[in-house]
């Protein structure tokens, strides 16, 4: 808390220039009104105030709105913005997606926190969270402005959250976007992908859909190994298990293409290694790679699954 | 990568002026403060001011208000410092530097410095 | 205007030695810190901020301490390429300055 000390002489603020730049914290705190402040706050951004210096801003604002700032002000706070805590951003009701954009630009690649230089900051995620809330849903503008921001954006979100995203944004995203995203965040984005990617032709859907496909069911991928994608091993390795399994020989060899050869390297690995414990030995022997622990010859394979479906 | 090049020694008559150029390349000119720094033989580190290429924004120590001036020429990403009315006590190296964040003015990146000899 | 102050000026150490080199601001600056480092004929070059935070790319072997008014910079382990000058600089509020400067050579 700054103590309350008169304005020396000929140091009141008529304006918000650089000559405050020189202004000790005191000063800024007796000598700069408020008000002032806060009508000229697109000025603030211009004049390379210290971390300290925001401090005394920072409170002057608090002290003119208690309620929370508008959005106004918020839109011009600049650096200003990382000083703000999620409590403070709370109060906030930001509707423009400029105001959001500006906000984030700031907090790019800026080393400011004596704590913590390189952690994401909480007042981020703060933002967006009132700032979807606002919207409703990640509408398709606001999902390509976070995600050029944090491409891992979308893999923070719940299942539940995802579910407020229309298919039509899915064209924002990218495949970096998604590369943290786990199973279950991945089967809600899927379906809205392959809706979204319906009306592509075989190769340039398979593009775009390539990196949702740890979301896809067996069926898809039956479907997809009809029409020579070449799927690479490190797509391969991210589909769901249970989807996988019930692919045969044939297909997994028609849809990884020329990539086939890749599996004895991942043998041991999920989903190969399950997939292979359900094939025959046989069938695993046509792809010529020697991949072993298939079901030996003469070996009756009971889909114990499928007989309790059928009861 | 960031580079800061800048012009060569100078040597001045007492009661001139020079003018020193810092030509920026590897990141975008108008994005950052430029700051300029000097140092006196055996002396330590003496800040001068800054300017920001994309506002012409400037901030002068009150020590050199009076006689240097801060340009940019975006065109060709250089920035200039100015500085009038020298004498020997104005001997030293010139280095221009950039901070990355403003409210943060740690120096991330210099150039090789100029020397500048006042002399008669 | 915040004046810096340093000690020692001048340090002489060997290779391997522990060093530590002491900066005092006349105001409080938090942890508005920065070192540098100089070599002749060559411009500083940033070592650590925030007092205590390791620039990329710095050796380990640098830290930095300290908040207010008294500051430290340690080089664990002092290595051939680390006789230098060592400035401080504060950066809690304009003008920015440095301090004198702590030079450290070879025993």
């Known amino acids: 808390e700054v103590e309350k000390t008169a304005c020396p002489s000929g140091k009141k603020a008529r304006e918000i220039d650089e000559s405050l730049i020189f202004y000790k914290k005191w000063e800024l705190e007796a000598c700069v009104d408020a008000a002032l402040l806060a009508t000229q706050m697109d000025r603030v951004n211009a004049i390379p105030f210290t971390y300290e210096q925001l401090d005394v801003l920072k409170h002057k604002l608090d002290e003119l709105y208690p309620q929370g700032y508008p959005e106004s002000v918020i839109q011009h706070l600049g650096y200003l913005f990382l000083k703000m805590s999620p409590e403070d951003i709370r109060k906030w009701n930001v509707t423009s997606l400029e105001t959001l954009k500006a906000l984030l630009e700031v907090n790019k690649g800026h080393e400011m926190s004596p704590q913590a230089p390189r952690r994401p900051l909480p007042q981020v995620a703060t933002l967006i969270d009132r700032f979807v809330k606002g919207r409703g849903q990640l509408d398709k503008d606001t999902l390509d402005t976070l995600t050029a921001f944090y491409p891992g954006y979308l893999c923070s979100l719940s299942p539940e959250e995802l579910s407020s995203v229309p298919p039509s944004s899915i064209w924002a995203v990218r495949p970096q976007d998604l590369d943290t995203c786990d199973p279950r965040q991945l089967d809600v984005l899927y379906p809205k992908a392959r809706l979204a990617f319906q009306n592509m032709n075989g190769s340039e859907y398979f593009v775009k859909i390539q990196s949702f496909l740890g979301g896809a069911p067996t069926e898809d991928l039956k479907a997809l190994s009809q029409q020579n994608v070449s799927m690479d091993l490190a797509t391969f390795m991210k589909l769901r298990t249970d989807a996988v399994l019930p692919l045969t020989v044939a297909e997994v060899q028609k849809l990884l293409g020329p990539h086939v050869e890749g599996l004895k390297a991942e043998e041991r690995h999920r989903p190969v290694r399950d997939w292979i414990l359900r094939q025959r030995q046989d069938d695993l022997d046509t792809l010529g790679l020697g991949l072993q622990g298939g079901i030996p010859n003469g070996y009756l394979v009971l889909d114990l699954s499928m007989q309790e479906a059928l009861s | 990568q960031v580079q800061l090049q800048q012009s060569g020694a100078e040597l001045v008559k007492p009661g001139a002026s020079m003018k020193l150029s810092c030509k920026a390349s590897g990141y975008t000119f108008t994005s950052y403060w430029m700051h300029w720094v000097r140092q006196a033989p055996g002396q330590g580190l003496e800040w001068i001011g800054a300017i920001h290429p994309n506002s012409d924004n400037t901030i002068y120590y009150q020590k050199f208000k009076s006689r240097v001036t801060l340009t940019v020429d975006k065109s060709i990403s250089t920035a200039y410092m100015q500085l009038s009315s020298l004498t020997s006590e104005d001997t030293a190296v010139y280095y221009c530097a950039i901070i990355i964040t403003p409210v943060v003015p740690k120096f991330d990146y210099w150039g090789q410095g100029t020397t500048v000899t006042v002399s008669s | 205007d915040i004046q810096m102050t340093q000690s020692p000026s001048f340090l002489s150490a060997s290779v391997g030695d522990r060093v530590t080199i002491t900066c005092r601001a006349s105001h409080d600056v938090g942890t508005s810190l920065a070192w540098y480092q100089q070599k002749p004929g060559q411009a500083p070059k940033l070592l650590i901020y925030?007092?205590?935070t390791l620039q990329t790319g710095v050796p380990s072997r640098f830290s930095g301490s300290g908040s207010g008014t008294e500051f430290t910079l340690t080089i664990s382990s002092l290595q051939p390429e680390d006789f230098a000058t060592y400035y401080c600089q504060q950066y809690s509020s304009y003008p920015l300055t440095f301090g004198p400067g702590t030079t450290v050579d070879m025993k």
């Open positions: 925030w007092a205590s």
